[in-house]
């Protein structure tokens, strides 16, 4: 059809209209008539591409006629009025309603003028994210799971992480026909360094004003990682008492601490107080290797530390260790 001239009438409508599954939507369509132009509209017609016949007709003398009267309604067209607004309301949107529609004005003397509108049927997805609790497997496993349920079109899921790893995303039909559930797993090799850190799942969808961000705090179960602190290699006779601390990182938390030496039980000057070992002043040099054994639900690990208490007074009075 040739392009309209300067004084021509124009049918105005958006190229695309979004509507939500199960809701109602209005397909807007208006006749724009220049100030000086005379026109008479005798009929409004809506049809769907690929289908014969009209789905909705409003005739100047006969009024409206619908292919599905309970689902369609002219919003503004009324008998006895100028037919300039062909906007059509559709109720109870279904997946199969998505497609191209033509809004047509039969005008005199300008003829038939039409415009095409693409109706997008959307479904807003529900999004959840959850941790996948893992142990030290030594190989890549899912540590977080992000699910966008019942979206149309399918939601787009991405991950943001400083820990490395890679996504594994899959799709499955949603509960409602035509909707899609997207599941994305964040996969990495578990380590104790990952435990307690977070990754973020970002869900994007046409129905969202902005992307939804869901943060997942990761859980990696691992046996204790043990070290002993509190000794600075400068312990001398006749100094104050000192403390050794058994530092343990584990998930779940440690259930018990056990102190011993390589020679067996603790000597009299060493007193265990949970994660700490109290070293009382001694009157003769010692050279003892202490062992701290830490237990949690996944096992036990230990650390060793050799302590020497040397002769020769310190330059300033101080404890055998800073405490």
């Amino acid at each position: 059809w040739p392009p309209p001239g300067t004084g021509d009438i124009i049918v105005q409508a958006p190229t695309q209209v979004p509507g939500f599954l199960g809701d109602s939507v209005t397909l807007p369509c208006y006749l724009q008539v220049p100030g000086m132009e005379e026109t008479h509209v005798s009929q409004l017609t809506w049809s769907r591409h690929g289908e014969s016949g009209s789905m909705a007709v409003f005739h100047q003398t006969q009024g409206p006629n619908y292919s599905e009267p309970k689902r369609l309604e002219f919003v503004a067209a009324r008998l006895g009025t100028e037919l300039r607004d062909a906007s059509l309301r559709m109720f109870g949107l279904r997946v199969e309603d998505e497609g191209n529609y033509t809004c047509l004005f039969v005008t005199f003397p300008q003829g038939s003028r039409s415009v095409d509108i693409w109706l997008r049927v959307l479904a807003k997805p529900q999004n959840t994210a959850e941790v996948q609790k893992v142990q030290l497997t030594g190989k890549p496993v899912p540590v977080a799971r992000c699910v966008s349920t019942g979206g149309r079109p399918p939601a787009h899921i991405t991950w943001h992480s400083d820990l490395g790893g890679m996504p594994n995303t899959s799709q499955a039909p949603g509960f409602l026909s035509g909707t899609v559930t997207v599941t994305s797993l964040w996969i990495l090799v578990p380590s104790s360094q990952v435990d307690g850190k977070s990754v973020t799942c970002k869900v994007e969808h046409e129905s969202f004003e902005k992307p939804q961000l869901l943060t997942v705090n990761l859980t990696v179960y691992y046996p204790p990682e043990v070290s002993i602190s509190g000794y600075d290699n400068n312990w001398y006779l006749s100094q104050n008492e000192a403390t050794l601390t058994c530092d343990a990182r584990s998930n779940p938390e440690p259930t018990g601490y056990n102190w011993s030496t390589t020679m067996g039980p603790l000597p009299p000057f060493a007193v265990a107080q949970g994660a700490q070992l109290l070293i009382r002043p001694v009157d003769k040099p010692i050279n003892t290797t202490f062992i701290c054994n830490v237990t949690n639900a996944l096992g036990a690990r230990q650390a060793e530390l050799t302590v020497q208490v040397k002769e020769g007074p310190p330059s300033e009075p101080s404890g055998m260790s800073s405490n």
Partner: antibody, heavy 121, light 109 residues
Framework: QVQLVQSGAEVKKPGASVKVSCKAS????????ISWVRQAPGQGLEWIAW????????NYNQKFTGRVTMTTDTSTSTAYMELRSLRSDDTAVYYC??????????????WGQGTTVTVSS | QAVVTQEPSLTVSPGGTVTLTCRSS?????????ANWVQQKPGQAFRGLIG???NRAPGVPARFSGSLLGDKAALTLSGAQPEDEAEYYC?????????FGGGTKLTVL
Amino acid sequence: QVQLVQSGAEVKKPGASVKVSCKASGYTFTSSYISWVRQAPGQGLEWIAWIYAGTGDTNYNQKFTGRVTMTTDTSTSTAYMELRSLRSDDTAVYYCARHGMTGRGWYFAVWGQGTTVTVSS
Amino acid sequence: QAVVTQEPSLTVSPGGTVTLTCRSSTGAVTTSNLANWVQQKPGQAFRGLIGHTNNRAPGVPARFSGSLLGDKAALTLSGAQPEDEAEYYCILWYSNKFVFGGGTKLTVL
């Protein structure tokens, strides 16, 4: 077939009125647009107005506004054109024409045989 | 007041091609002028040929075609027949009224 049959010739005095009829057959009258056109002796064709038969909606050539009235009678599928305050220069053959649609546009499809109106004192 | 001008008369040989034009006093003819062409043979009623610049009416032979030619509307008759001898009128729309051209008398000789 589609036909428009007009009323017979009229002779009128200046200042009088004339009402010309145009009876349609062979199509759905109420969905049609009908134009009235005239041709004075030795002159060109002149468009007077159109009417949408279904509702009686009209559009008049401003030259004739106030002197001409177009009406329809859907029960008899007849269109009427009344011209008042006749002058001698209204002497002409008056035609009714039904507009038809071709493709996405209208055309002057079928014409009546014409009605001669003579205005003479 | 818009004036629509046509060639008063044209002659074409049988089988020949002829183009009738329609000029507007207000400037170039566009699709918004909804150019119509009607034919009147002697002693017969008018008959619509073309609507909306280039849409041939049902039953009109394909040898008749409408178009825009430069700044004018045009009716081209390709392969003229003796029965095409008639008066041809162009009609243009100007926002709120139709204006007829003076007509072209076409002779097929």
